[in-house]
Interface confidence: low
């Protein structure tokens, strides 16, 4: 096995770039929400911590072994072209665990994207026009999903017939942003590790 070189793998580098952008965008959005929603409990101490991906994806479980196992040969290596053909891992031999980890990240992003888009549709109806989701953050989620490019059906945006409760929507926005920031940190750590290994 050759010694690692400093230049990043061109296959993985786009994902590292996007994950860094994602972390920056969600952190900025969370800061904006905290400032704008001053009278809403929006700090990590005040909110209820809720993980919308709980029991639906297994990002932490799937991605943790990648960090624990520095030697990739310890992982169950095999060709996994059936899982991804995106620019992040374009035509490279990847471990089964790595592919599982990245597909789980993709599913996380997809779930948050649906939630955020649904929430933004409600916030746009608010006569106060107090806060909206940063289009840059939504674009960055989209870019990372495209870079991962898993063969996955698109999830339709949830439509809500009842009149939105704007107070609860803004609270839910804070809860989602806090949870998504934690997930973005995990994603960034995974991409940094994969880029360095």
């Amino acid at each position: 096995r050759n010694l690692p070189v400093a230049t990043p793998d061109p296959g993985m580098f786009p994902c590292l770039h996007h994950s860094q952008n994602l972390l920056r965008a969600v952190s900025n959005m969370l800061q904006k929400a905290r400032q704008t929603l001053e009278f809403y409990p929006c700090t990590s101490e005040e909110i209820d911590h809720e993980d919308i991906t709980k029991d639906k994806t297994s990002t932490v479980e799937a991605c943790l072994p990648l960090e624990l196992t520095k030697n990739e040969s310890c992982l169950n290596s095999r060709e996994t072209s059936f899982i991804t053909n995106g620019s992040c891992l374009a035509s490279r031999k990847t471990s089964f665990m790595m592919a599982l980890c990245l597909s789980s990240i993709y599913e996380d992003l997809k779930m948050y994207q649906v939630e955020f888009k649904t929430m933004n549709a409600k916030l746009l109806m608010d006569p106060k026009r107090q806060i909206f989701l940063d289009q840059n953050m939504l674009a960055v989620i989209d870019e990372l999903m495209q870079a991962l490019n898993f063969n996955s059906e698109t999830v339709p945006q949830k439509s809500s017939l009842e009149e939105p409760d704007f107070y609860k929507t803004k609270i839910k926005l804070c809860i989602l942003l806090h949870a998504f920031r934690i997930r973005a940190v995990t994603i960034d750590r995974v991409m940094s590790y994969l880029n360095a290994s």
């Epitope: 009278f39 409990p41 107070y167 609860k168 609270i171």
Partner: nanobody, 114 residues
Framework: EVQLVESRGGLVQPGGSLRLSCAAS????????MYWVRQAPGKGLEWVAT???????AYADFVKGRFTISRDDAKNTLYLQMNSLKPEDTAQYYC????????RGQGTQVTVSS
């Protein structure tokens, strides 16, 4: 165990006033944000007002200028002074420790009618 007990509400004429109080126990009241939420017949739970630790307050647009939320940390008591009451203020009012009203008292009925 968190306990929130609201005072009795009542029947008030339009334009009238009413003061609700809420006795809190089982948690550190002085370091908690507190809320009043309400539920009108056939409607969902609606946020009314928030009071932060230290006393600064925020109100829903529909009660702004008419309702005042206050607290007495020494007595572990939350208050809601309701003035210029309207028929549409008729609802079950709850004192709550969380914004969504999950940690709330039994509620007290306020009816505004002539």
């Amino acid at each position: 165990e968190v306990q929130l007990v609201e005072s009795r509400g009542g029947l008030v004429q339009p334009g009238g006033s009413l003061r609700l109080s809420c006795a809190a126990s089982g948690f550190t009241f002085s370091s908690s944000w507190m809320y009043w939420v309400r539920q009108a017949p056939g409607k969902g739970l609606e946020w009314v007002a928030t009071i932060k630790t230290g006393g600064s307050a925020a109100y829903a647009d529909f009660v702004k200028g008419r309702f005042t939320i206050s607290r007495d940390d020494a007595k572990n008591t939350l208050y809601l002074q309701m003035n210029s009451l309207k028929p549409e203020d008729t609802a079950q009012y709850y004192c709550a420790r969380d914004y969504a009203g999950r940690l709330r008292g039994q509620g007290t009925q306020v009816t505004v009618s002539s």
